[in-house]
């Protein structure tokens, strides 16, 4: 009877013990097993859950414009006064709805190279108004002419095919023509077939981004999504030294298992450069843990302040010597056209650049870019990409539109924010197929062995005391 | 097919005037702007005169300020050059030229004036 | 005003040689210099203009090159008919000026 009783209280103390290292053992080998999972789940081919999405994002995304209505053209053009400007806004486009094209797989390099199709549909009720809502803008061919041309004798022809449209140094347009393009009345007059069209996204619908290539992350995940080249050059032509690299991916999404001390670092075709995203804060969103990643202000710091980007510096004289900062000219991408890019408001710019305009109000939260990417499987599961396109405009003695300018001006066109949220299905569905399987392997593990132990230790004293007991 | 034909050449005596033009065929002269080049015997080209597109800007070289006047006329696709004061040195073959970006593409067959007494 | 000088003022050459005919502004005129060819009691013809853009029509053997100051117009293999006297010209400011000109014989 005394023997049943110890052989049942041992019987339990080794089935405990035999759960608790079960449950130990599920911990390296479950991770084993998520580890593998996730890395066949996360190569870009046919039959994954990353090639579904990364074909055809299932976000949808928008792309929110604030327009700078300038509120004193003529006193700016006359007096050379400060622009003051007002925001108008939003004006919401759907963008990225459309599949990517072209897709070719190389088994050979382990890429996979495609192009992304661009679109873009009005969306009237997340607008404040319609897309025939006129504003005062600068006028861009205006702006743009002695800028390309900086040669005397042409200046002085463009001046009287300016003077002979009725141009002038600002102009009224509606939000379509100023986006997606209109004909210019001044460049209709250039006696030679070039583009009349101008806008400033312009060509923009029925036009396609890339050739990207890709690594498919088949040989090694650890650079899956990872831009082996674009239109086929590993370099963009645009800027010296190490600044012309492509590095990273296009943000969609990054190698697995992202830590927080990793800077993620992609590729902007809209900004013509690469750029990166630090460990800001861990959030949760729609109940999956994330990783909130932001552009630092150390991305848009002048040489001085961060020598890594003395090559982002093309230019001095606007520059002041290349001590401004947080504006950044991307002519040499644009055609020579005298194109900035900056954060909206001038957020993290230095004060000469914003201090000829009235009306700004940078503000963190609203301007700044983020990326929200989940980081097991190294999704961007959300994000809010914020930019601001500019235009220089300069003093031009032989242009009357722009011979009282006194001093040079970074004028605020438009400032856009384009945001993508992992929808409610998809949310819950990542979180059945992702965190929950780990959540619940977790769970798991921590039962058996949590079980295992208190099995053991209870089974163990109950066993010690009944001995103890039979002693006596 | 472009073309420019000059005429009004002539001899002329010192202090006389002459007026030259340039008549155009396949582009309209307002679009582009026409200049006058002129080369005396035995020497160099010498820009002379400009009338920017539309009319919108006459330019002359120092030679001739004062005494050579450039004109168009729209309906009529002409260019003229209004000499006037004219002096030995202004002896040569004058050519129409068209131009936009400021090298000259299409020219005339040129016309002769001559100064002399 | 800018100068516009040329050199040589004349040369020799046979059929088949390769010719470089040099022209140096008197100031920056970045790439605005264009190069004519013209023949006895003829109208100039324009060659290249952008310091080196061969205008239509003109044979690949014309090329021209530089920036800034100094300027080059080379014809790689010299044919019968390109015996003429070749000028240069800038195009960047007003009053335009031309090179004092080349003449190129035949040796």
């Known amino acids: 009877m005394g023997c049943d009783r110890n052989c049942g209280l041992i019987a339990g103390a080794v089935i405990g013990a035999v759960l608790a290292v079960f449950g130990g053992i599920l911990m390296p080998v479950g991770d084993m097993l998520i580890e593998k999972t996730i890395k066949r789940e996360v190569v870009l081919e046919e039959g994954t859950t990353a090639f579904k999405n990364w074909v055809k994002t299932g976000t949808t995304v928008y792309r929110q414009f604030w327009i700078f209505d300038v509120q004193n053209p003529d006193d700016v053009a006359k007096n050379s006064s400060k622009i003051k400007v007002k925001q108008r806004g939003p004006y919401t486009y759907r963008v990225r709805y459309l599949a990517k094209e072209n897709i070719t797989q190389d088994p050979e390099d382990h890429t996979v190279s495609f192009v992304q199709p661009n679109g873009a549909i009005f969306e009237p009720s997340l607008s404040v108004g319609t897309e025939d809502d006129n504003f005062t803008v600068l006028n861009l061919a205006v702006a743009a002419a002695p800028h390309i041309y900086q040669n005397s004798f042409v200046q002085v022809v463009l001046n009287s095919l300016i003077k002979k449209s009725k141009s002038s140094m600002f102009q009224t347009r509606s939000l379509k023509e100023l986006l997606w393009g209109y004909k210019d009345p001044f460049l209709s007059l250039v006696p030679y077939p070039i583009s009349t069209t101008v806008g400033v996204f312009y060509p923009y619908n029925d036009t396609v981004d890339g050739v990207y290539k890709v690594f498919n992350g088949k040989d090694n995940i650890s650079k899956v999504a990872i831009i082996e080249s674009y239109k086929g050059k590993r370099n963009l032509s645009y800027w010296p030294s190490y600044c012309d690299m492509i590095n990273g991916t296009d943000a969609a999404s990054f190698p697995p298992f992202v830590e927080k001390s990793r800077t993620l670092r992609f590729f902007s075709s809209d900004i013509c450069r690469s750029i990166y995203a630090v460990f800001g804060s861990e959030i949760d969103l729609k109940g999956i843990p994330v990783y909130r990643f932001v552009l630092p202000a150390n991305a848009f710091a002048s040489p001085l302040q961060n020598p890594d980007n003395h090559c982002f510096c093309t230019e001095k004289v606007i520059s002041n010597n290349c001590t401004s900062y947080g504006v950044l000219d991307i002519g040499k991408c644009k055609e020579g056209k005298p194109v900035y890019i900056s954060l909206p408001h001038f957020l993290h710019a230095s004060p000469d650049v914003s201090e000829p305009i009235e009306g700004l109000h940078p503000n963190e939260d609203e301007h700044r870019t983020y990326l929200d990417v989940e980081p097991i499987t190294g999704f961007t599961l959300q994000f809010a990409k914020r930019l601001q396109v500019n235009i220089l405009v300069k003093p031009a003695r032989k242009i009357e539109a722009l011979k009282n300018l006194k001093r040079p001006y970074i004028v605020p066109i438009l400032w856009l924010n384009e945001t993508g949220t992992i929808g409610d299905e998809k949310a819950e569905m990542f979180k059945t197929q992702v965190t929950g399987k780990i959540k619940l392997l977790g769970m798991v593990e921590m039962a058996l062995l949590g079980i295992g132990v208190v099995m053991f230790v209870a089974f163990m004293i109950s066993y010690c005391a009944c001995k103890s007991k039979n002693g006596k | 097919e472009v073309q420019l034909v000059e005429s009004g050449g002539g001899l002329v005596q010192p202090g006389g005037s002459l007026r030259l033009s340039c008549a155009a065929s396949g582009f309209t002269i307002s679009s582009f702007g026409i200049h006058w080049v002129r080369q005396a015997p035995g020497k160099g080209l010498e820009w002379v005169a400009w009338i920017a597109p539309y009319g919108g800007y006459t330019y002359y070289a120092d030679s001739v300020k004062g005494r050579f006047t450039i004109s168009a006329d729209t309906s009529k696709n002409t260019a003229y050059l209004q000499m006037n004061s004219l002096r030995a040195e202004d002896t040569a073959v004058y050519y129409c030229?068209?131009?936009?970006?400021?090298?000259?593409?299409?020219w005339g067959q040129g016309t002769l004036v001559t100064v002399s007494s | 005003d800018i100068q516009m000088t040329q050199s040589p003022s004349s040369l020799s050459a046979s059929v088949g040689d390769r010719v470089t005919i040099t022209c140096r502004a008197s100031?920056?005129?970045?790439?605005?210099v264009a190069w004519y060819q013209q023949k006895p009691g003829k109208a100039p013809k324009l060659l290249i203009s952008y310091a080196t853009s061969l205008y239509s029509g003109v044979p690949s053997r014309f090329s021209g090159s530089g920036s800034g100051t100094d300027f080059t117009l080379t014809i790689s293999s010299l044919q019968p008919e390109d015996f003429a006297t070749y000028y240069c010209?800038?195009?960047?400011?007003?009053?335009?000026?031309f090179g004092q000109g080349t003449k190129v014989e035949i040796k």
């Open positions: 010209q800038q195009h960047s400011n007003a009053p335009l000026t």
């Open positions: 030229a068209r131009s936009f970006f400021g090298y000259f593409d299409y």
């Open positions: 100031q920056d005129v970045s790439n605005w």
